[in-house]
Amino acid sequence: AVNGTSQFTCFYNSRANISCVWSQDGALQDTSCQVHAWPDRRRWNQTCELLPVSQASWACNLILGAPDSQKLTTVDIVTLRVLCREGVRWRVMAIQDFKPFENLRLMAPISLQVVHVETHRCNISWEISQASHYFERHLEFEARTLSPGHTWEEAPLLTLKQKQEWICLETLTPDTQYEFQVRVKPLQGEFTTWSPWSQPLAFRTKPAALGKDT
């Protein structure tokens, strides 16, 4: 038997992926466990194998279909179960009725690129990945810029309160190396959270022209 406190958290990427993390204090490391997804009004169900990510937590991705296919709607409720093998039987360790569009975490933005760079400013664009057409333009973004000698945690957050897939960074220092990241969140969903940060985009501002006041 497995005792201790259990936490089972899942997020839907709005298209065809549910990612889950199960934490269990005192769980047995060698136990084979899986997540089972059973939608209330669909003909399919899906399973993924929980793999350890730390001493007492496991994660897996339920792949529901092609990455850009709309596999669940706002009306769907999915019963999610953690099942662990005990001898020849499967034991239910955790269960939840999951409303996918109340528990959203989108994929990190992709295809970051410098559109235009000057001495003091830089225009950067990006794309969102595997985001449902349901959201229309109702998304928000956070961005941050890593300056020399600072950490990501120290970088101030810039908020874009609409679906704007570009930003113009101002008041930069000439001839300086920076890094930039962005993340996205839909307005929809009580338990919705920010996407992971994008891969950092490195760029360098242009040097100030010689003899010019900077």
């Epitope: 709309q70 709607t73 009306v75 109340e102 057409h133 307005l187």
Partner: antibody, heavy 117, light 107 residues
Framework: EVQLVQSGAEVKKPGATVKISCKVS????????IHWVQQAPGKGLEWMGW????????EYAPGFQDRVTITADTSTDTAYMELSSLRSEDTAVYYC??????????WGQGTTVTVSS | EIVMTQSPATLSVSPGERATLSCRAS??????LHWYQQKPGQAPRLLII???QSISGIPARFSGSRSGTEFTLTISSLQSEDFAVYFC?????????FGQGTKLEIK
């Protein structure tokens, strides 16, 4: 500019079927949801259902499920709502609207349907 | 089915004054509440989504707030074009339902 233009007023007898069209422009119809809402004099606004043109799925409100059919023709960017077995309480203005599933961002001008013997 | 109750049914306010419209849900709906304005002979127009997020192009005098299952639409300084019927709508549980409306009239 986003536009939804609905077909004209209809007068129908009880038991008949009405089919209303909604021609859209100014956005990608194939990636949109088109909804239908009834506004009857005594009943207020009622959400009838929607069609998801990308997924090819429909969703109907339980109160209309047995009598309503929502379809779309992506070649003409037109959505349709068919209501059958009409009764006097179906006398109402019917709106098509565009939006995500949760709220309605743009509306058609409405189509008045009168059911009378 | 979630029942949305709006109050008052009719609200009489003078131009330039503040109007406060209320909408209560019969069960918890998180922030899944949206507001519309409808003028006579016209289709409804979306004003506010998720309880408090203003829609682009809607004047800043329109604002929304939430306390539990009670939602409020506030119009800070009424203009002549604001006199209309206002509906709330929940999107927490399908079928999504509307309130019966509050008619805002000139005092």
């Amino acid at each position: 500019e986003v536009q939804l233009v609905q077909s004209g007023a209809e007068v129908k007898k009880p038991g008949a079927t009405v089919k209303i069209s909604c021609k859209v422009s100014g956005f990608n119809f194939k990636e949109s949801l088109i909804h239908w809402v009834q506004q009857a004099p005594g009943k207020g606004l009622e959400w009838m259902g929607w069609i998801d043109n990308e997924a090819g799925e429909t969703e109907y409100a339980p109160g209309f499920q047995d009598r309503v059919t929502i379809t779309a023709d992506t070649s003409t960017d037109t959505a349709y709502m068919e209501l059958s077995s009409l009764r006097s309480e179906d006398t109402a203005v019917y709106y098509c609207a565009r939006g995500g599933p949760w709220f309605l961002s743009y509306w058609g001008q409405g189509t008045t349907v009168t059911v009378s013997s | 089915e979630i029942v949305m109750t709006q109050s008052p049914a009719t609200l009489s306010v003078s131009p330039g004054e503040r109007a406060t419209l209320s909408c209560r849900a019969s069960q918890i709906i998180s922030n899944n509440l949206h507001w519309y304005q409808q003028k006579p002979g016209q289709a409804p127009r979306l004003l506010i989504i998720y309880g408090l997020q203003s829609i682009s192009g809607i004047p800043a005098r329109f604002s929304g707030s939430r306390s539990g299952t009670e939602f409020t639409l506030t119009i800070s300084s009424l203009q002549s074009e604001d006199f209309a019927v206002y509906f709330c709508q929940q999107s927490n549980n399908w079928p999504y339902t509307f309130g019966q409306g509050t008619k805002l009239e000139i005092k």
